[in-house]
């Protein structure tokens, strides 16, 4: 039975040209995290493998930095970066946990970080 929950940075906003940290945290499970994938739509942004470290997809290498921790830093933001981002935690033996973050990139300087909140976990098995 999957008992874990993912806490994320939730709905966040940032200024065009700036940077933002996407962060998820898996709690309430003793499952081993083998890999975390960061995704946007059908694009894989990055993989953090527990043994092998980070792989940033070549499409994003110039604008994405690994960390802090299992998080991801997006740099040189454009309005096209607005949208949903997902952290996919691959764990053993539980399976897969998914967290969702919505990022809005704003033209003006009114961007504020949303509050942290918990979302229900979603899962699928391979």
């Amino acid at each position: 039975m999957m008992t874990g929950t993912i806490e994320t940075t939730g709905n966040i906003s940032a200024e065009k040209g700036g940077s933002i940290i996407l962060q998820c945290h898996l709690s309430s499970t003793t499952a081993q995290v083998t890999q975390v994938n960061w995704e946007q739509q059908d694009q894989l942004l990055a993989i953090c493998n527990a043994d092998l470290g980070w792989h940033i997809s070549p499409s994003f290498k110039d604008r994405v930095a690994p960390g802090p921790g299992l998080g991801l830093t997006l740099q040189s933001l454009t309005v096209n970066d607005t949208g949903e981002y997902f952290c996919i935690y691959h764990t053993y033996p539980d399976g897969t946990y998914t967290g969702r973050i919505f990022l809005e990139v704003l033209e003006s300087s009114v961007a504020e970080h949303g509050a942290r909140f918990q979302i229900p976990h979603h899962h699928h098995h391979h």
Epitope: D42, L44, I47, D51, G53, W54, S57, H124, H126
Partner: antibody, heavy 120, light 107 residues
């Protein structure tokens, strides 16, 4: 230039342990990931597992109970042991390097492969 | 495990013509797909990674495309030295898995 060379017996008896070694030249095995992949005759390539730069191992769950991958950093080589073999383990066995940072799980250097037959 | 299914099993194409190989993943693997070329008696060689990026030294007649579950390797103008078996692989999650291969021959 990274070079990998597999060695080991080409014939193993059923129920025995298959042992292969991969000698690496031109690169240190304390960097990147070092892998074993096999190809049974007429079948798909099958990922066996890796030993990472730090010595951590991953094994394909389908083989996990029978597989051990180890390394000898002083000789710059790594090894595969597969116990309790059957005819289904007959395959060409490849050792390979994977540069995860640049290419993810795509394998960029392969040995030439060694054929292992399981038969009495 | 994620199953990678290639089609067709074999393909005969005239020299200079286009060859198209398909690979379907049993679940969404985003862009975590590689393609390999294996010539007779040789080990596989990496051609494409991250679905569409050519590996160092790979001729530009080879291209990869797709995301999600459907991927394609295209050889825009087949040369004699391209005769080989081509394999796709997913590395979205372990265990990393391969397709069954597509044999490309000259018609």
């Amino acid at each position: 230039e990274v070079q990998l060379q597999e060695s080991g017996p080409g014939l193993v008896k059923p129920s025995e342990t298959l042992s292969l070694t991969c000698a690496v030249s031109g690169y240190s095995i304390t960097s990147d990931s070092w892998n074993w992949i096999r190809q049974p005759p007429g079948k798909k390539l099958e990922y066996i597992g890796y030993i990472s730069y730090s010595g951590n191992t991953y094994y394909n769950p389908s083989l996990k109970s029978r597989v051990t991958i180890s390394r000898d950093t002083s000789k710059n080589q790594f090894s595969l042991k597969l116990s309790s073999v059957t005819a289904a383990d007959t395959a060409v066995y490849y050792c390979a390097r994977l540069d995860f940072s640049n290419y993810g799980g795509a394998v960029d250097y392969w040995g030439q492969g060694t054929t292992v037959t399981v038969s009495s | 495990d994620i199953v990678m299914t290639q089609s067709p099993d074999s393909l005969a194409v005239s020299l200079g013509e286009r060859a198209t190989i398909n690979c379907k993943a049993s679940q969404n693997v985003r862009t975590a797909v590689a393609w390999y070329q294996q010539k007779p008696g040789q080990s596989p060689k990496l051609m494409i990674y991250s679905a569409s990026y050519r590996y160092t030294g790979v001729p530009d007649r080879f291209s990869g495309s797709g995301s999600g579950t459907d991927f394609t390797l295209t050889i825009s103008s087949l040369q004699a030295e391209d005769v080989a078996v081509y394999y796709c692989q997913q590395y979205y999650t372990t265990p990393w898995t391969f397709g069954g291969g597509t044999k490309v021959e000259i018609k």
